[in-house]
């Protein structure tokens, strides 16, 4: 097909000789083509397209990629001739860097539905060169890790040696989608979640007297986990006193948040203090009530069949521990004013002779 009508884009891949890195070309079909294939949804500048142009509609076919030999030979089908280049929907992925990737790459829809569609194509002139040794030593890696639950940032490798003030305007993409929120050479992440992982592309324009090039770099971002540096945090009970009715059953719940630990051995127990005595209570098994990638909330209850006068003189202590340290929360029972008649008190005193405590059993989940 005739490629003279294709829109043209010039890209530069300055690769690091010290690390493995990938490169991506998007089939960014042009506007204002009116054809079926080149249709762009009409978005205002403040709106962000869900995908790059053309790639979003389910009914549109994938694109075909070609490489144009420098000697004027016919276009080559990339899938047949270049095993290190992978066609993935509307993107072209270069798995290995090297100057042999320099050349012109053409993309167009696989199926042509009208004569106008012939010109619906993009020619990308890609220049590939090793990064000059003059580049700074601490340039950002093409593989960057973000620690879950913490703050972090993703730096554009080709601009990481420049200050934010010097940096040109940058266009970022994540997994092929335009990120309109930032134009700087760094994406700042206030709190890292698993959805932050993916393939990021950063583009900026470099101009000389003759022409203008888009300098592009690709960053693979992983979200990683690490052991907490905090001891567990007791969420409940919050208050150190609890109003109760004598002779009535009572459940006191202890809920604690445990930060992530690769080897997770949480300890959660109830014990009772009575004057100079202190003993651990046999209570139902702890159970996980909420588990996320960065922490887990565990609950363990102490159950009294009926509250006695003696219980009012005792302190109930929830003790939680991880490999970093322990936390405790004490609860003192206090009789509700105006509650409980003589019968209730009589019943409560009878129970003091037995001190029977009944428990339920729960399954305990952990990381």
């Amino acid at each position: 097909f005739n490629i003279s009508g294709c829109s043209t884009k010039k890209l530069l891949w300055a690769y690091s000789t010290r690390s493995e890195e990938e490169f991506i070309l998007f089939c960014d079909l042009p506007e204002p083509q009116k054809s079926h294939f080149c249709h762009r949804s009409q978005l205002s500048p403040t709106q962000v397209p869900d995908h790059l142009p053309f790639t979003d509609s389910k009914d549109l076919p994938d694109v075909q990629w070609y490489r144009q030999p420098s000697n004027g030979d016919p276009l080559e089908d990339i899938r047949k001739s270049y095993p290190h280049i992978i066609q993935d929907k509307c993107t072209l992925r270069f798995l290995t860097p090297g100057v042999n990737n320099t050349g012109s790459y053409i993309c167009r829809p696989k199926m042509i539905k009208s004569p106008y569609d012939v010109a619906c194509c993009v020619k990308m002139i890609l220049e590939v060169k090793p990064q000059s040794n003059a580049s700074c030593e601490n340039s950002a890696s093409h593989k960057q890790d973000l620690l879950l639950g913490s703050t972090g940032s993703i730096s554009c490798p080709s601009l990481s040696c420049q200050s934010d003030a010097q940096s040109p305007e940058v266009t970022w993409y994540k997994n092929g989608k335009l990120l309109s929120m930032t134009r700087s050479n760094r994406i700042v992440v206030d709190e890292v979640y698993i959805y932050h992982q993916g393939t990021y592309v950063c583009d900026y324009t470099q101009s000389d007297t003759a022409s203008s090039w888009t300098v592009r770099a690709v960053v693979q971002v992983r979200t990683i986990v690490g052991d907490t540096k905090l001891k567990p945090d007791i969420l409940d009970p919050v208050e150190s006193t609890l109003e109760v009715e004598l002779g009535k059953p009572l459940t006191i719940s202890c809920k604690a948040r445990f930060g992530f630990e690769r080897v997770f051995n949480p300890v959660m127990k109830w014990y009772i203090k009575d004057a100079d005595l202190e003993w651990e209570v046999s209570v139902p098994e702890a159970k996980s009530i909420k588990s996320t990638l960065k922490d887990e909330i565990i609950e363990r209850n102490i159950i009294l069949e009926k509250v006695t006068q003696r219980d009012l003189r005792r302190t109930f202590v929830c003790f939680v521990q991880n490999s970093i340290g322990n936390t405790t929360q004490s609860v003192q029972l206090k009789e509700k004013r105006g509650s409980g008649g003589l019968n209730d008190i009589f019943e409560a005193q009878k129970i003091e002779w037995h001190e029977t405590v009944r428990f339920q059993s729960h399954h305990h989940h952990h990381h």
Epitope: S141, D145, I194, Q197, V225, G226, R262, L293, H367
Partner: antibody, heavy 124, light 107 residues
Framework: QVQLQESGPGLVKPSETLSLTCTVS????????WSWIRQPPGKGLEWIGY???????NYNPSLKSRVTISVDTSKNQFSLKLSSVTAADTAVYYC??????????????????WGQGTTVTVSS | AIQLTQSPSSLSASVGDRVTITCRAS??????LAWYQQKPGKAPKFLIY???SLESGVPSRFSGSGSGTDFTLTISSLQPEDFATYYC?????????FGQGTRLEIK
């Protein structure tokens, strides 16, 4: 660009303590786990243990009584000490970055960056 | 400790061949398995995690599959640089363990 380099004596006498250090360059020791692995001549790989940069450790039970792994974040280094060595401890010792990758509500741990290894011979 | 058994222990193949290496765990390990490649005198190189997720920069001719107790590493079309020893590794429970290795040689 993260690189690991093991250092330490290549020859240790029986019953003595083997001491190795791994220096991390081109990146921070923070946020990662760091493992030691060994490979006896002509044999497979054996995991010795790991340390998180904050100091949490986990050791292979078969070596636990003899192993200590420590970390010095200010020097970007972590170390291995193996006491009461015998000829059976002769091996190539590797240090590796041990990363926990979060993926779809779970975690997967891999040793994604390795040192080139250092040979330690236990002999009198 | 969970034992990983690789088969075969050694394998001869030619450039362009399709090769499959198997790793069997002594108990279920979900998808908590990684594959490594080691060349003589060199450190192991990480290829695959989560049983089937390819590390970026690893050629797409490598693929992993399996879950539970049975796993495979497949090289779709052997290249000269692929001749090496391959190890599987589980991290489902401690201690972390490796398979005994599969040596892939040129026929």
């Amino acid at each position: 660009q993260v690189q690991l380099q093991e250092s330490g004596p290549g020859l240790v006498k029986p019953s003595e303590t083997l001491s190795l250090t791994c220096t991390v360059s081109g990146g921070s020791i923070n946020n990662y786990y760091w493992s030691w692995i060994r490979q006896p001549p002509g044999k497979g790989l054996e995991w010795i243990g790991y340390i998180f940069y904050s100091g949490t450790t986990n050791y292979n039970p078969s070596l636990k009584s003899r192993v200590t792994i420590s970390v010095d974040t200010s020097k970007n280094q972590f170390s291995l000490k193996l006491s009461s060595v015998t000829a059976a401890d002769t091996a190539v010792y590797y240090c590796a970055r041990d990363v926990g990758i979060a993926a779809r509500n779970s975690y997967y741990y891999v040793m994604d960056v390795w040192g080139q290894g250092t040979t330690v011979t236990v002999s009198s | 400790a969970i034992q990983l058994t690789q088969s075969p222990s050694s394998l001869s193949a030619s450039v362009g061949d399709r090769v499959t290496i198997t790793c069997r765990a002594s108990q279920g390990i979900s998808s908590a398995l990684a594959w490594y490649q080691q060349k003589p005198g060199k450190a192991p190189k990480f290829l695959i995690y989560e049983a089937s997720s390819l590390e970026s920069g690893v050629p797409s001719r490598f693929s992993g599959s399996g879950s539970g107790t049975d796993f495979t590493l497949t090289i779709s079309s052997l290249q000269p640089e692929d001749f090496a020893t391959y190890y599987c590794q589980q991290f489902n429970s401690y201690p972390i363990t490796f398979g005994q290795g599969t040596r892939l040689e040129i026929k």
